[in-house]
């Protein structure tokens, strides 16, 4: 099952071009920008999604304190280099030969340098903290109901096994979702927490990546959960390497 056979579309990625030219006339979908074939039964990697986005027309209770090594994606959008599996290449460069090293979610983890910059390996982001602030409601959400609904959402919509949702914290109006996935834990076929977090982020912003589905309608016991702010922190298996001048 790679794509919807009846009308040849990609349910998990609307930024694709699909045609029935696969083996035996099966529907096959390729990501915009890279032209890489994607598996439409699961989430597309963040690298291919970013590449597609850059190629598209422009109109198109106890809270966790992020550690000193937590990264926030301050650089925003760029046109990434992806490897043949669709993962981010460890070294990214722009058109002006400025280069930097990224982690597995594509967030810069070193100072910028020139073409001589070396990035020996793609460092895995093993812990993601999604920090949400919800709009005022009549009362606080029940913590266990919120936990259950968010776990259900990540399992059913983003195909992430709940064992990778380490915790859901709630201190009204702040919700924190902790995703954790060590290299040793991730089996073949498991959705990467970085990809799940990216799909969730785009859903929350009203920019769903899913084909022809309604946007995200998050409800806890029937009460709408409307998010007004999102901040995502990324923690890598190896701490990032920035010079002191960045910290001042």
């Amino acid at each position: 099952h790679t794509a919807a056979q009846d009308n040849c579309t990609c349910p998990t990625n609307k930024m694709t071009v699909c045609s029935p030219d696969g083996p035996g006339g099966r529907c096959q979908c390729r990501a915009l920008g890279s032209g890489m074939a994607v598996d439409c039964s699961t989430l597309t990697s963040k690298c291919l999604l970013l590449k597609a986005r850059m190629s598209a027309p422009k109109n198109a209770r106890t809270l966790v304190r992020p550690s000193e090594h937590a990264l926030v994606d301050n650089d925003g959008l760029y046109d990434p280099d992806c490897d043949p599996e669709g993962r981010f290449k460890a070294r990214q460069c722009n058109q002006t030969s400025v280069c930097w090293c990224v982690n597995s979610v594509g967030v810069r983890r070193t100072d910028k340098g020139d073409l001589s910059l070396r990035c020996d390996e793609l460092v895995r982001t093993h812990h993601i903290l999604i920090d949400l602030r919800h709009r005022p409601t009549a009362g606080a959400f029940n913590h266990s109901d919120l936990d259950a609904e968010l776990r259900r959402l990540f399992r059913e919509r983003y195909r992430l096994h709940p064992k990778f949702v380490a915790a859901v914290h709630y201190e009204q109006p702040t919700i924190q979702i902790e995703l954790r996935q060590n290299t040793s834990q991730k089996a073949a076929g498991d959705v990467d927490i970085g990809d799940a977090a990216y799909y969730f982020e785009r859903d929350i912003k009203g920019e769903s990546l899913f084909q022809g589905r309604g946007g995200l309608d998050l409800r806890v016991r029937g009460e709408p959960l409307q998010v007004e702010r999102t901040l995502i922190y990324y923690l890598d298996e190896i701490p990032p390497k920035f010079s002191m001048k960045r910290l001042t």
Epitope: R151, R152, R155, E156, P162, A166, A167, E178, R180
Partner: antibody, heavy 119, light 111 residues
Framework: QVQLVQSGAEVKKPGASVKVSCKAS????????INWVRQAPGQGLEWMGV????????SYNQKFKGRVTMTTDTSTSTAYMELRSLRSDDTAVYYC????????????WGQGTMVTVSS | DIVMTQSPDSLAVSLGERATINCRVS??????????MHWYQQKPGQPPKLLIY???NLESGVPDRFSGSGSGTDFTLTISSLQAEDVAVYYC?????????FGQGTKLEIK
């Protein structure tokens, strides 16, 4: 209230196929995946696989791969499990069970469908 | 596959007494403090019924004489004061890893 109602008992010959249905009500069908579990007479429970009602694709227990197909019809909120090349040791009660909210527990079960394989 | 071993296979307890069923798992089902272990009750001619999820959480509507404990590889289901309606077969189940597996079952009877 949440209900899973399964189709009636079946008697099949060895080598034949059987298709069991599971009609859901009382909740949004596409919000929860459906699992299939079987129980041979006097024996324990055996997980066969799970189908995503949202995406329509399934993950099967390796033991049944190639013989089982799980499908859904969202227009009628019904899940189906088809088992092919039946053998006498496939005689069992077949249950559908819904995933619970947070931890992949099975919170609601169908009443079961008895499938007897006999020549 | 993860193997679940329940003990004992059968158990006879007097009404009002405590009943304890154990489940040992071949590998840990703990993920960041969340144990993907559940307990079900099955009465003759009926489907299983969820009692406990995530090792120790009581399912809605289940009497509080039922409780679950344990983590990692060793888990326990306890009925604090046995009632006549508790006569059934009890199963543990892991949902940490596909294929999901069940224990062989423990038959609980009244002494």
């Amino acid at each position: 209230q949440v209900q899973l109602v399964q189709s009636g008992a079946e008697v099949k010959k060895p080598g034949a196929s059987v298709k069991v249905s599971c009609k859901a009500s009382g909740y949004t069908f596409t919000d929860y995946s459906i699992n299939w579990v079987r129980q041979a007479p006097g024996q324990g429970l055996e997980w066969m696989g799970v189908i995503s009602t949202y995406y329509g694709d399934a993950s099967y227990n390796q033991k049944f791969k190639g013989r089982v197909t799980m499908t859904t019809d969202t227009s009628t909120s019904t899940a189906y499990m088809e088992l092919r090349s039946l053998r006498s040791d496939d005689t069992a009660v077949y249950y559908c069970a819904r995933y619970g909210d947070g931890y992949n527990q099975f919170d609601y079960w169908g009443q079961g469908t008895m499938v007897t394989v006999s020549s | 596959d993860i193997v679940m071993t329940q003990s004992p296979d059968s158990l006879a307890v007097s009404l009002g007494e405590r009943a304890t069923i154990n489940c040992r798992v071949s590998e840990s089902v703990d993920s960041y403090g969340n144990n993907f272990m559940h307990w079900y009750q099955q009465k003759p001619g009926q489907p299983p019924k969820l009692l406990i999820y995530r090792a120790s959480n009581l399912e809605s509507g289940v009497p509080d004489r039922f409780s679950g404990s344990g983590s990692g590889t060793d888990f326990t289901l306890t009925i604090s004061s046995l009632q006549a309606e508790d006569v059934a077969v009890y199963y543990c189940q892991q949902s940490y890893e596909d294929p999901y597996t069940f224990g062989q079952g423990t038959k609980l009877e009244i002494k």
